[in-house]
Interface confidence: low
């Protein structure tokens, strides 16, 4: 892991998540804005969190305000797919939308 | 449901070792980030590490650097904490925590960053 | 490091009655994606950590809605409307913004 890297997150916008286990990659989370968000089933996905929505919609709390989490642990579970992706954080707001 | 349950824990001596273990249940365990937290006694909350979904990437508060290792057995639904060299300070009740960072949806993701599941705790402590 | 600090440390408050806890961070929380990864967390005696409100202000599944937070940038606010008996135990701010990740020293509330 990533242990003598800069304890921040990178910024949006960058060309590609943060390499885990490249000593030179920042130890933190990845801001939105990089090329691809996690798609479900593809392998080359970073290892995030999969996206919930692809088998049912995430049934939690909040769902008028965008930007919030919806609360875990309701009925949906998150779909999950990406099983064998590279470790780093998810990096929404980019290019190609998540494959459900 | 949803469950962490730690194990692992018990009286050492300075210098000695342990081996945390945390089983999951109730969630697709090979998906989350986690994380170890400890308490030392009638003492705030100390994060002490933290693993990526797949175990790749590892982060270590500066007290246990190089003391302490987190690992992981996705097959297994399992956290691990392997501690060396143990001292006093490292007496607490060490918490197994599951991190959850967000969801995309619709071309959108969404990050939260919070740990919204805690084991019970085991008890490590250290003493001659 | 990124230091949370909590005041006050102790809030003996009256049933019914509204209580308030601070924390304040030694920099900004406000991260690169605009999000501000800071939560609150209740600790009931003899039990683990439990989640209450993330992202300043959202309250997490099953949390009443007598608590409520906010604030920005190194500021924030735990708030209880009116405190219950179950309410009782230690509040903790946390951010996750940046490693490490950090906790305040704790706030205990407890009953007059």
């Known amino acids: 892991g990533v242990t003598s890297a800069p304890d921040t997150r990178p910024a949006p916008g960058s060309t590609a998540p943060p390499a885990h286990g490249v000593t030179s990659a920042p130890d933190t989370r990845p801001a939105p804005g990089s090329t691809a968000p996690p798609a479900h089933g593809v392998t080359s996905a970073p290892d995030t969190r999969p996206a919930p929505g692809s088998t049912a919609p995430p049934a939690h709390g909040v769902t008028s305000a965008p930007d919030t989490r919806p609360a875990p642990g309701s009925t949906a579970p998150p779909a999950h797919g990406v099983t064998s992706a590279p470790d780093t954080r998810p990096a929404p707001g980019s290019t190609a939308p998540p494959a459900h | 449901q949803v469950q962490l349950v730690e194990s692992g824990g018990g009286l050492v001596k300075p210098g000695g070792s342990l081996r945390l273990s945390c089983a999951a249940s109730?969630?697709?365990?090979?998906?989350?980030?986690m994380s170890w937290i400890r308490q030392a006694p009638g003492k705030g909350l100390e994060w002490v590490s933290y693993i990526s979904s797949s175990g790749t990437t590892k982060y270590y508060a500066d007290s246990v650097k190089g003391r302490f290792t987190i690992s992981r057995d996705n097959a297994k639904n399992s956290l691990y904490l392997q501690m060396n060299s143990l001292r006093a300070e490292d007496t607490a009740v060490y918490y197994c925590?599951?991190?959850?960072?967000?969801?995309?949806?619709?071309?959108?993701?969404?990050?939260?960053?919070?740990?919204?599941?805690w084991g019970k705790g085991t008890t490590v402590t250290v003493s001659s | 490091d990124i230091v949370m600090t909590q005041t006050p440390l102790s809030s003996p408050v009256t049933l019914g009655q509204p209580a308030s806890i601070s924390c304040r961070s030694s920099?900004?929380?406000?991260?690169?994606?605009?999000?501000?990864?800071l939560s609150w967390l209740q600790q009931r005696p003899g039990q683990p950590p439990r989640l209450l409100i993330y992202k300043i202000s959202n309250r997490f599944s099953g949390v009443p809605d007598r608590f409520s937070g906010s604030g920005a940038g190194t500021d924030f606010t735990l708030k209880i409307s009116r405190v219950e008996a179950e309410d009782v135990g230690v509040y903790y701010c946390m951010q996750a913004t940046q490693f490490p990740l950090t906790f305040g020293g704790g706030t205990k509330v407890e009953i007059k």
């Open positions: 925590v599951r991190e959850d960072i967000g969801y995309c949806s619709g071309g959108s993701c969404f990050y939260y960053y919070y740990m919204d599941v």
């Open positions: 109730g969630f697709i365990f090979s998906d989350y980030y």
């Open positions: 920099q900004s929380l406000v991260h690169s994606d605009g999000n501000t990864y």
